[in-house]
């Protein structure tokens, strides 16, 4: 099953997020991803946990998953590099770099997104954009077209309260509010974009969606700049 969803969002403007990737398993959407370099897509490590025997590919330039679009192209994956410290039972270090079989053909609908390198928290209340093809309601309806939602960043202390995530949010993670509008499991790997810069990647741990007491959790890319640079080098 696809990992994740956007709840309470709306259809994105077609091709307005040219960095957006669909990580696919055996031809079906599995997770979100974000193009960070011509030949590299950043996603979440947990996305490939159950993909051992399947064919992993990356779809770029898409708005609709099913309809033909001139900018759409499916790339094979040359190499999958999960963060070495990622583990199945934790949300920590939930990052994955996918090297495409060739450099992506760039254009208006396919373009890497600058990512944050300065290791400083995004200010609470900042509105950030998250997008994905995950299911759009609790009944499990899957969208064909890309959805997005704007979410305010939540301070880490609130996110760490016992009734929220009870101390699980390390300095390498960040939270966004989840009051009916939310990302969730299957949008995992997708980008959290603040001020036009990639700040976070949707984690793929299981949690209830759309409940304000269980904020969305995102891996802070700035905290992993050295690792990302070392893989891309």
């Amino acid at each position: 099953p696809p990992r994740g969803r956007i709840l309470g969002g709306r259809e994105a403007e077609a091709h307005a997020r040219p960095y957006m990737a669909s990580v696919q398993l055996n031809g079906a959407h599995l997770c979100g991803g974000v193009l960070v370099a011509e030949q590299w897509v950043l996603s979440a490590a947990h996305c490939l946990e159950d993909a051992a025997d399947g064919k992993v590919q990356v779809l770029l330039g898409a708005h609709s998953l099913s309809q033909p679009e001139p900018s759409k192209r499916l790339y094979d994956v040359l190499r999958a590099v999960p963060h070495p410290d990622s583990q199945p039972d934790t949300i920590d270090h939930d990052l994955l770099l996918l090297q495409l079989s060739e450099k992506a053909t760039l254009g208006p609908a396919v373009r890497p997104l600058p990512w944050q390198r300065v290791d400083r928290d995004v200010a609470p209340g900042t509105l950030c954009d998250v997008a994905g093809w995950g299911i759009v309601n609790h009944a499990g309806r899957r969208p064909d077209s890309l959805q997005h939602v704007l979410l305010p960043v939540l301070d880490r202390a609130t996110c760490n309260r016992r009734t929220h995530h009870d101390g699980a949010i390390t300095e390498r993670l960040m939270c966004a509010e989840s009051n009916r509008r939310d990302s969730c499991k299957g949008d995992s790997g997708g980008p959290l974009v603040c001020g036009g810069v990639l700040e976070g990647v949707v984690t793929s741990g299981s949690r209830v969606c759309g409940n304000r007491k269980k904020p969305g959790i995102y891996t802070r890319v700035a905290s992993y700049a050295a690792w990302i640079d070392s893989v891309l080098a």
Epitope: R156, N160, T163, G167, V208, K213
Partner: antibody, heavy 116, light 112 residues
Amino acid sequence: EVQLQQSRPELVKPGASVKIFCKASGYTFTDYYMNWMRQRHGETLEWIGDINPNNGDPSYNQKFKDKATLTVDKSSSTASMELRSLTSDDSAVYYCAREGPSFAYWGQGTLVTVSA
Amino acid sequence: DVLMTQTPLSLPVSLGEQASISCRSSQTIVHSNGDTYLEWYLQKPGQSPNLLIYKVSNRFSGVPDRFSGSGSGTDFTLKISRVEAEDLGVYYCFQGSHVPPTFGGGTKLEIK
């Protein structure tokens, strides 16, 4: 190692005020709420209130809203609690405790004795 | 406020025996997010409380597996399978689902 170091015991007169301190170390102070508890001798613990160190926003148990004022100083990673209009009923050990996970980390307690 | 009632007040046990402490809340302590924030703390003489169990049945890191928590709704139990000398002290249940959070009155575990 997470540590919460509380200020020394206080002997105060009835009607006076006292401010007790809780200095945090071993973690990022602004990443966790700080809670305060009271324990009278031989009795259970009572929750006084909590504070978000990011913005200094406190929440109080109604029972203590006219008794306690919670503040933080981010620059020194210190939470503090002022107790006012003290009576002998306020004689107790006062604890700070970090929230997350649960109350896993506590200060050693500050004994406040109210006596003429 | 949610009243947390612990029984017994005092529990004399022999080392190696099982001990069981009950905690009853005056209303359900299932939070609106679906979780139950029932915790158990041990306070040894002259010390601060130590977290043993969170969310009814989860042992905090470093807590021996002889401690186990169970229950739901309004009735909860802490069991110590084989009491050791270091387990002696006052045990408190705590609910964090409703504001204000509240502690039980305590159960003193002592040697018979």
